[in-house]
Amino acid sequence: KSPIFGPEEVNSVEGNSVSITCYYPPTSVNRHTRKYWCRQGARGGCITLISSEGYVSSKYAGRANLTNFPENGTFVVNIAQLSQDDSGRYKCGLGINSRGLSFDVSLEVSQGPGLLNDTKVYTVDLGRTVTINCPFKTENAQKRKSLYKQIGLYPVLVIDSSGYVNPNYTGRIRLDIQGTGQLLFSVVINQLRLSDAGQYLCQAGDDSNSNKKNADLQVLKPEPELVYEDLRGSVTFHCALGPEVANVAKFLCRQSSGENCDVVVNTLGKRAPAFEGRILLNPQDKDGSFSVVITGLRKEDAGRYLCGAHSDGQLQEGSPIQAWQLFVNEESTIPRSPTVVKGVAGGSVAVLCPYNRKESKSIKYWCLWEGAQNGRCPLLVDSEGWVKAQYEGRLSLLEEPGNGTFTVILNQLTSRDAGFYWCLTNGDTLWRTTVEIKIIEGEPNLKVPGNVTAVLGETLKVPCHFPCKFSSYEKYWCKWNNTGCQALPSQDEGPSKAFVNCDENSRLVSLTLNLVTRADEGWYWCGVKQGHFYGETAAVYVAVEERKAAGSRDVSLAKADAAPDEKVLDSGFREIENKAIQDPRLFAEEKAVADTRDQADGSRASVDSGSSEEQGGSSR
């Protein structure tokens, strides 16, 4: 018998979608071999309709896909826009169609439901509202109006015009009689439950001359939308529940065991700890719709998610809901990047941010995740030369090393800089990653003076002391501006005396400014790098003043001072400072703990065998 397993029968209706999961033993060979879905012909052959190698039959063009989940030993065939022509016998299998590694699946697509004789069919989603209209004749205008539900053989009174309400409908039903001109009454039922489905009868009058109208109420449990995202990528759940719940608390929950649906985030301020730093609930529109962005997807994020509206901020029967089944593909196109970066007070970090290399011209952004209320991510810097005022002189976004990675450098660190930061672009919204900056005990590795004052027309020399651990690194000075840090000439002055227990490999590298002008005022950085990969930096502010006494200035080490309009990121990106940013919705990454290395290159972390990755910014 074949080791492949799947659904033997699939029944659906025209216009629907199906999602057929086929299970296979997850051996190394099976995981990587061709997967296929084929239709069995009358003469016994099996014509491939779609395969994992990219083939899609013209019959399936634009309406089917096949996704392999090697870690689970499953692959999923999605087919949309079903028609009765799709009914037939199929196989899902591995390898070559004619071999035995397959499973037979019967797909039956029937016509959609038609109207019953004199019965009005109401098809409404779970949790929503239905209005059942009941016409009557003039002679019954003053008589009792009622709605019954057929339970087995017996009609059970649901509501009537004398004020009776069946206990099962308390607080969510009303009977409206239209003005005298219209011979119509209507029954409105809110917060529909699955148990509300069935045959109803509305009646005006109680004698043989009463007017009756049949209604068939179908309550649909929302079909989960299948969502496939890459590990370490991001997902956005767009939730549109209708204007009737615009003022009701919203939630996103994840179904766990049993009937529990654990709140992931809601508008009442609750957020699951596992999503700290990597989730945003974007403000709802007037129509009650909202979206939730989760970044840094983890394997364990896979599952069924429901969004809904209820005053409790969590799932209750009668909540209007939308559903998604999230699959997290471990064969991810998004590279591993450090999820925790460590730096010391007064030191610096260099963060590597991945982006889709096909979008090298996209605008890059870096923002600081804030957990208050529903979460937000105010922008700090972008690749177009904008830097938030408070970060001037200590934050730079560099396009290097390029080819799918950009670098963000933050120096003059304080404990207030600890937190979660998001890397993103205005291109592919799936490429949003989160990094956590942690401030640890220790001293900065690079030593520079504090405030420096230069005199107009004179020469200024500013020292930067590099410990011996950086002997193999390129050392540089640059002048900071909004678009980056422009390299300047510098002089290697030989070994530094600023470090105890540091040999001849330590270095003193000076920046010399000849004939100082007003234009020389500003922030200067010294730093280390290896090729296009940046490591630690230290910042010095140079002020320029009028001449007081002749001569050049040579500055010695002193305590460095930190230098002393908001753009906010949401899933639609608001227009900020006349910059409209096209929907770069949000993102994050798994927190993790590995060994902290003395790593000058704070942007290049080693990756351990688990999912946890860190990078060190400054050594202790």
């Epitope: 699939v10 057929i20 079909e223 009937e259 069924r304």
Partner: nanobody, 126 residues
């Protein structure tokens, strides 16, 4: 919670038919799939069949040992799942359990199911 109550078990002759019912009550709006497992004395619980649904689409899974003889169906309005068992064999003798799941990754695995009924005895004599 979701409560499951099985009925329809009994003693039949080999070759006869039997129909089991499983009625679900409680928070059934969270369920996604319902199925049948069986356990013969001294043996492990064994997958028989499962039906999962998504909107108006049903997916039916069967164990090789019952293919072509057993049929699973459901009545959405009554929150009930049925197991029609034809051409019964003595090997089919077991306690049949109904199970329900909110998230089902592999329908053959008992631990994937969140709720279980008390079971109903089916005995097939030769």
């Amino acid at each position: 919670q979701v409560q499951l109550v099985e009925s329809g078990g009994g003693l039949v002759q080999a070759g006869d038919s039997l129909r089991l019912s499983c009625a679900a009550s409680g928070r059934t709006f969270t369920t996604y799939g319902m199925g049948w497992f069986r356990q013969a004395p001294g043996k492990e619980r064994e997958f028989v069949t499962t039906i999962t649904w998504s909107g108006s689409t049903n997916y039916k899974y069967y164990a090789d040992s019952v293919k072509g003889r057993f049929t699973i169906s459901r009545d959405n309005a009554k929150n009930t799942v049925y197991l029609q068992m034809n051409s019964l064999k003595p090997d089919d003798t077991a306690v049949y359990y109904c199970a329900a799941s909110t998230v089902l990754r592999d329908p053959r695995v008992p631990t994937e199911y969140d709720y279980w009924g008390q079971g109903t005895q089916v005995t097939v004599s030769s």
